[in-house]
């Protein structure tokens, strides 16, 4: 039951995370005009991965796509690539994890196969989350660098007089959405990997030994009771995921509310 809950929760968290990564990738507010300590303008600029926008105080908003590939900064291209890879991996992970969910029965799929799929989707979610976090962080670093460069340029020129006001950009909402979404996807992936450990049928330390007594035949399987409970009959004891030696009374560990990645 706990494994099912962990798997289900991991799936839901990852789903929310990937939806967030998609939203962040599509958002226009990756960088927004810095309003602090700047002359108050009647025009507000903001930029995304795919287009830049200008919102006038009149309410009129105009967005222009970046219709060039070669003319764009390499860093922006890298961020785009990371976000797309994150989305693709996350989408595949979601697809795989749907079939891996314990609460969904597909033909006579064995627990071992489900455990495999759960682990695969978990790894995919982890990589997806890392891609998103990396993409957003690279963009944020780019912003910080440009911000201080434009601040330095602001006070240079003829006799220190500011001739033109340089638009400085700061963190937009999409960055925070991306960081949170990447984190959620990562956490969801970790939960799926944890759930996989519970799904994986355990290989017993002793081979099944048959004792032939007179009159009737009884088969004893040391430790077999634990191995067969919860998931129905377990005929094939394949080793799916070896998380190290565990004692009989070991409790499966789950991330607490204090576990942040």
């Amino acid at each position: 039951m706990a494994v099912t809950a962990c798997q289900g929760l991991g799936f839901v968290v990852s789903l929310i995370g990937i939806a967030g990564i998609i939203a962040a990738t599509c958002m226009d507010q990756w960088s927004t005009q810095d309003l602090y300590n700047n002359p108050v303008t009647a025009v507000f600029n903001y930029q995304g991965l795919w287009r830049s926008c200008v919102r006038e105080s009149s309410g009129f908003t105009e967005c222009r796509g970046y219709f060039t590939l070669l003319g764009l900064p390499a860093m922006l291209q890298a961020v785009r690539a990371l976000m797309i890879v994150g989305i693709v991996l996350g989408a595949i992970g979601l697809l795989v994890s749907i079939f891996a969910l314990k609460c969904i029965r597909i033909g006579s799929m064995e627990d071992s196969a489900k455990a495999n799929m759960t682990l695969t989707s978990g790894i995919m979610f982890i990589v997806s989350g890392l891609c998103a976090i990396a993409g957003v962080s690279v963009f944020a670093n780019m912003l910080v660098t440009n911000f201080w460069m434009s601040t330095a340029n602001m006070y240079t020129g003829m006799g220190g007089m500011v001739q033109t006001v340089q638009t400085r950009y700061t963190f937009g909402a999409a960055l925070f959405v991306g960081w949170v979404a990447g984190g959620l996807t990562l956490i969801g992936g970790v939960m799926m990997c944890i759930a996989c450990r519970g799904l994986a049928p355990e290989e017993t330390n002793y081979k099944a030994v048959s004792y032939h007594a007179s009159g009737h035949s009884v088969a004893y399987k040391p430790g077999g009771f634990k191995a067969s409970t919860g998931f129905g009959s377990n005929t094939k004891n394949k080793k799916i995921y070896d998380g190290g030696a565990r004692t009989e009374d070991e409790v499966q560990s789950y991330p607490s509310k204090h576990d942040y990645v």
Partner: antibody
Framework: EVQLQQSGREVVRPGTSVKVSCKPS????????IDWVKQRPGQGLEWIGG????????VYNERFKDKATLTADKSSSSANMQLSSLTSDDSAVYFC???????????WGQGTLVTVSA | DIVMTQSPSSLTVTAGQKVTMSCKSS????????????LTWYQQKPGQPPKLLIY???TRESGVPDRFTGSGSGKDFTLTISSVQAEDLAVFYC?????????FGAGTKLELK
């Protein structure tokens, strides 16, 4: 056709207040900002401030912050400007205008002449 | 505040003549985000409210005759009337639409000889 109808001329005493109204028609009132502009006889134009009728958000020229108060009444679809502590310097024609793309003013009221006289 | 300086303060012209008037801003009105200059030109005839002629420094408002042309970028702007008509006689104002407070130039008065 977009029109902005302003209230009639006002003759007021120094130290008192006056309210000038502007009633737009021909478009959705809450969709455009309304700006107010002052023009003293034979002089140039001075921007007082603007109001977003939808949200009630205002932006003022610092010079008029203590002089003018801009409001918008959605129920009557009218924008108002209250001028307080009037002096002879406040004698002018006051225009309301609709702010559009480019932050320009495409439609103007006919103007309200406010005369401050003892 | 942004100071808008218009020159000349008045112009005496004859019908059919080409006219240019200047407007200079104390700060650049060019927005890097869309490469548009936030400068507007208005025409005001006696006893009337101003009329919008040109916005974004060079975009003509619908219904405005094509003899009116706006040009310039950054801090220096020009309004050109290719062939002045009698009905064009008025005061022309430029306006900063980029920085608050939105400021107007003192105007250029166009008079007939």
């Amino acid at each position: 056709e977009v029109q902005l109808q302003q209230s009639g001329r006002e003759v007021v005493r120094p130290g008192t207040s006056v309210k000038v109204s502007c009633k737009p028609s021909g478009y959705a009132f809450t969709n455009y900002l309304i700006d107010w502009v002052k023009q003293r006889p034979g002089q140039g134009l001075e921007w007082i401030g603007g109001i977003n009728p939808g949200s009630g958000d205002t932006v003022y020229n610092e010079r008029f912050k203590d002089k003018a108060t801009l409001t918008a009444d959605k129920s009557s679809s009218s924008a108002n400007m209250q001028l307080s502590s009037l002096t002879s310097d406040d004698s002018a024609v006051y225009f309301c205008a609709r702010r559009v793309r480019g932050n320009s003013f495409d439609s103007w009221g006919q103007g309200t002449l406010v005369t401050v006289s003892a | 505040d942004i100071v808008m300086t218009q020159s000349p303060s008045s112009l005496t012209v004859t019908a059919g003549q080409k006219v240019t008037m200047s407007c200079k801003s104390s700060q650049s009105l060019l927005n890097s985000g869309n490469q548009k200059n936030y400068l507007t030109w208005y025409q005001q005839k006696p006893g009337q409210p101003p009329k919008l002629l040109i916005y974004w420094a060079s975009t003509r408002e619908s219904g405005v005759p094509d003899r009116f042309t706006g040009s310039g970028s950054g801090k220096d702007f020009t309004l050109t009337i290719s062939s002045v008509q009698a009905e064009d006689l008025a005061v022309f104002y430029c306006q900063n639409n980029y920085f608050y407070p939105l400021t107007f130039g003192a105007g250029t008065k166009l008079e007939l000889k």
